[in-house]
């Protein structure tokens, strides 16, 4: 069976707090627990939710949660079914409402000497016990004229005189809290000896120089006084005018009039209407200048036809608020239509072309007119003037690619190769009307290109092939001056490219015919075995039917290669000592002989007094010093070849001798001894 | 020995009501929940209502209005009464109690 | 109005293959678990297999479990068996005490 071990209990609860209805049970297989208020499945909200078995309440609420909570734990195997005992809140509640008149039926109704009867229409559980206010005074009960009734939150007037009016209100506490009334109730009981007013001064914007009326009207039995005061308290009459106020005139019916205002008029006037009895009644208006400031430049808008788009007109800062309208051509804008305004907004709908032109907005109030232009242009989509065409370019020359458009505004134009976006740089420059110009064309340049011409309405574009006519060249071209190795095989290479495949053959400058151990093989020229007579110039010609020919010349020399007879070797010197590096070189030509220590060249005619480079090539190094440890190269160079070879140099502290050591003790490392 | 038996089904006109019933017998149904549960021929189980151990009753959206369950606790017997027939209420009509136990069903047959 | 559907709505196996059928209810059931399996045979009435999920109900093969939770839930039989050849029901109960059946899967031999 199941059976309940927690049951959910009748309990207190405050409304818009938190409570909890327990249930727990146990059963001997799985049961689910569902929540019935006044047998009805409760629904989970986020307000009230099913938390485990029990019913959770995020905050209680007096409507929702009044009824009989029951729980219910159901094995929907068996369908055994057990229900919890009744249980349901005790809500504590206060909630504010209005003061309102109970009797008579309608304000008209009061009259003095009748009785008024006002409710508070605070409610809550517990009832709450009630206070009742007149301009924010407590009434206490029991007080001359008025009876308090807590029962049915009445407060009633009997009689209701001119003492009792004024501005009631009510507060209610409970053991919740506390609530005040959330509309209070105003009591007007006429006094035929007090100041009524009858025609208040309004705000009055003039412009700079105009004239300004203030209107002030009271009644009493017998007729009140009436005065005008500026800000300053400074009374006006017709007799007496403050400096500033000289053209200030009031009116047998209490009207004031201003004429020629200037900034200086401008401020507070307060009417003062006294009765016979009754406190005076203090009426205020103000009057202010009119003006009107600049208005903000417009950016000139671009627009695509079909589009539907807006511009809004900011009107400028103005007292009073300005005006604002739309105009074109001289022509005020509709307020419906395809071009009109709404608001302070022009709106296009379904732009034209035509559409395109100068909108002007116009603000104005009393202290004037202010105007704006705003320039408006219909985007088009580009047309062509000229597409770029196939093209045969020639090589090195500048090439030019035609892209040529017209559209509103002026179209961009961008150039594509391979796909590529190009930008402009030396080889490439675009334009203002947009044709693309090659600076030296390159056989690569011949490829795909493709140009867009593009405004906010849309783009178009079109490519053009271009081919390459390529010059006829040497490539690369043959190095005029070129050695050869004296007894060794050697080659010239020479190729060239042109618009046809050139032919190309060697020959001596002086016209003689090549030797049998040379051959001209397809360009190169092939020494078998190099002799001194090779010596000499040399010239490549290559040539095709449609571009002629071109020559290079090619100065062969014959040498013997450098080889080094002496090369400088690891050396160690104490420091202050003098040290040699030996380096000797032959060849032909005669090599000559260069020194790098320490990663830069020694100049033979900035090394100092310290070194000394001899004509056999050796370097000697006087005096030397920590500093001169290094690697040292000995460069050996003629006009066919060059080559290198390199040494360390070590300078070490001389070693001081101890007492063991004789005299005549070898050093401990190989040393260079001066 | 706990058991339902279902009764009260046979030919009915459209138009027409019936009343079904489901006699329970070894358990309360003061403490139960009751089902009816209909299978038209070659179709799946549907749904028709439920009546809970306090006699509240619970319907499919589509049985409201035609269909009334009710019980008599002295008899320890359920009643589906029917009304307003369609043909495609033709059906064997199932009580059961919770999810386990069910009747051998009883079948009805709206037809003119 | 809720639905409950299954799928497949027809399912071919054979003797000792592992079958998976999956309900999906339209909104979640209650307490996200009160979900029952049936099995029916012509002529019979419908017999409880699974409740609340994933519990097997007393005299039911081990073979048989169920898994899910909220709105998605499936049956799995282990390793199909002669007698399991027949139609298969999910059952959803939901808040305000309203139950639904799915349109029921029908397992034949392949």
């Known amino acids: 069976a199941i059976v309940f071990i927690k049951q959910p209990s009748s309990q207190d609860a405050l409304q818009g707090r938190r409570a909890l209805l327990r249930c727990e049970v146990e059963a001997p297989g799985p049961v689910h627990v569902y929540w019935l208020l006044d047998g009805a499945p409760v629904q989970d909200t986020e307000r009230r939710f099913a938390q485990g078995s029990s019913l959770s309440f995020a905050a209680v609420d007096r409507l929702q949660d009044s009824g009989t909570f029951q729980c219910v734990a159901r094995d929907d195997v068996t369908g055994e079914e057990a229900r919890s005992a009744n249980a349901s809140f005790n809500i504590k509640w206060i909630e504010a409402g209005p003061v309102v008149l109970k009797h008579p039926a309608s304000e008209a109704e009061i009259q003095p000497q009748t009785q008024v009867t006002l409710r508070c229409h605070i409610d809550g559980h517990p009832r709450p016990t009630y206070q009742w206010f007149r301009d924010g005074t407590p009434l206490s009960d029991g007080q001359s004229n008025h009876t308090v009734s807590s029962k049915e939150r009445n407060l009633t007037l009997r009689p209701a005189g001119p003492e009792h009016s004024g501005l009631y209100s009510c507060c209610a506490h409970s053991a919740f809290g506390q609530a005040c009334s959330s509309q209070n109730f105003t009591l007007s009981i006429a006094d035929e000896s007090f100041a009524r007013v009858v025609l208040a001064p309004q705000d009055v914007v003039v412009a700079r120089y105009e004239e300004a009326m203030f209107h002030c009207q009271f009644s009493a039995q017998p007729p009140p006084s009436l005065q005008w005061l500026f800000e300053d308290e400074t009374p006006i009459t017709n007799r007496s005018r403050p400096p500033h106020l000289r053209r200030a005139t009031v009116f047998a019916n209490g009207s004031l009039l201003l004429t020629q205002v200037r900034p200086r008029n401008a401020g507070i006037y307060r009417c003062i209407g006294q009765g016979q009895r009754g406190p005076p009644i203090i009426l205020e208006a103000t009057l202010h200048l009119a003006e009107i400031e600049d208005m903000p430049l417009f950016e000139p808008r671009v627009f695509t036809a079909g589009s539907e788009e807006r511009v809004t007109c900011l009107p400028p800062k103005g007292l009073p608020e300005p005006s604002v309208w739309w105009e074109h051509a001289g022509v005020r804008l509709p307020t419906h239509g395809r071009v009109y305004q709404k608001g302070h907004e022009l709106v296009l709908a379904n732009i034209a072309e035509s559409d395109a032109g100068v909108y002007t907005c116009h603000a104005a109030n009393l202290a004037g007119q202010r105007r704006q232009d705003v320039n408006i242009t219909v985007a088009t989509v580009p047309s062509w003037l000229k597409k770029p065409q196939d093209s045969q370019l020639e090589e090195g020359k500048p090439g030019y690619l035609d892209c040529l458009t017209q559209a509103t505004p002026k179209p961009t134009v961008v150039w594509y190769r391979n796909q590529m976006l190009i930008s402009e740089d030396s080889r490439f420059e675009v334009f203002k009307n947009g044709t693309l110009r090659i600076n030296s064309v390159e056989v690569y340049d011949g490829t795909w290109y493709r140009c867009m011409s593009s405004t906010p309405a849309g783009s178009i574009e079109a490519q053009a092939r271009v081919q390459v006519l390529e010059k006829l060249k040497f490539t690369p071209p043959p190095q005029p001056q070129q050695c050869m190795e004296f007894d060794k095989e050697a080659t010239v290479p020479c190729s060239a490219t042109g618009r046809e495949k050139p032919t190309i053959k060697w020959e001596r400058a002086d016209g003689s015919s090549l030797p049998e151990w040379v051959t001209d093989n397809a360009g190169t020229l092939h020494f078998a075995r190099v002799t001194r007579d090779d010596a000499g110039n040399y010239t490549c010609i290559a040539s095709n039917g449609p571009q002629g020919q071109i020559r290079a010349h090619v100065q062969l020399t014959v040498a013997v290669f450098i080889t080094f007879k002496v090369e400088p070797e690891r050396t160690t010197v104490y420091q202050g000592h003098t040290a040699l590096l030996q380096c000797e070189a032959q060849g032909d030509p005669k090599p000559l002989i260069q020194w790098k220590g320490k990663d830069r060249i020694l100049d033979p005619t900035k090394l100092g007094p310290r070194m000394h480079i001899f004509q056999n090539g050796s370097l000697v190094i006087h005096d030397v010093a920590p500093e001169d440890s290094g690697r040292y190269t000995c460069i050996a160079g003629n006009s066919c070849n060059i080559k290198h070879t390199e040494a360390p140099l070590y300078v070490v502290d001389k070693p001081v001798p101890e007492e063991s050591e004789g005299p005549g003790s070898p050093p401990p490392y190989k040393m260079i001894q001066t | 020995e706990v058991q339902l038996v279902e009764s009260g089904g046979g030919l009915v006109q459209p138009g027409g009501s019936l009343r079904l019933s489901c006699t329970a017998s070894g358990f309360s149904l003061s403490n139960h929940v009751m089902n009816w549960v209909r299978q038209a021929p070659g179709k799946g189980l549907e749904w028709v209502g439920i009546i809970d151990s306090s006699g509240s009753t619970y319907y499919a959206s589509w049985a409201k209005g035609r269909f009334t369950i009710s019980r008599d606790t002295s008899k320890n017997t359920v009643y589906l009464q029917m009304n307003s027939l369609r043909a495609e209420d033709t059906a064997v009509y199932f009580c059961?109690?919770?999810?386990?136990?069910w009747g051998q069903g009883t079948l009805v047959t709206v037809s003119s | 109005e809720i639905v409950m559907t299954q799928s497949p709505s027809t399912l071919s196996a054979s003797v000792g293959d592992r079958v998976i059928i999956t309900c999906q209810s339209s909104?979640?059931?209650?307490?996200?678990?009160?979900l029952a399996w049936y099995q029916q045979k012509p002529g019979k009435a419908p017999k409880l297999l699974i409740y609340?999920?994933?519990n097997l109900a007393s005299g039911v093969p081990s073979r048989f479990s169920g898994s899910g939770s909220g709105a998605e839930f499936t049956l799995t039989i282990s390793s199909l068996q002669p007698d399991d050849f027949a139609t298969y029901y999910c059952q959803g109960g939901y808040n305000g005490n309203i139950y639904a059946f799915g349109q029921g899967t029908k397992l034949t031999v392949l």
């Open positions: 909104q979640s059931v209650y307490n996200n678990n009160l």
């Open positions: 609340y999920t994933s």
């Open positions: 059961a109690r919770g999810l386990y136990l």
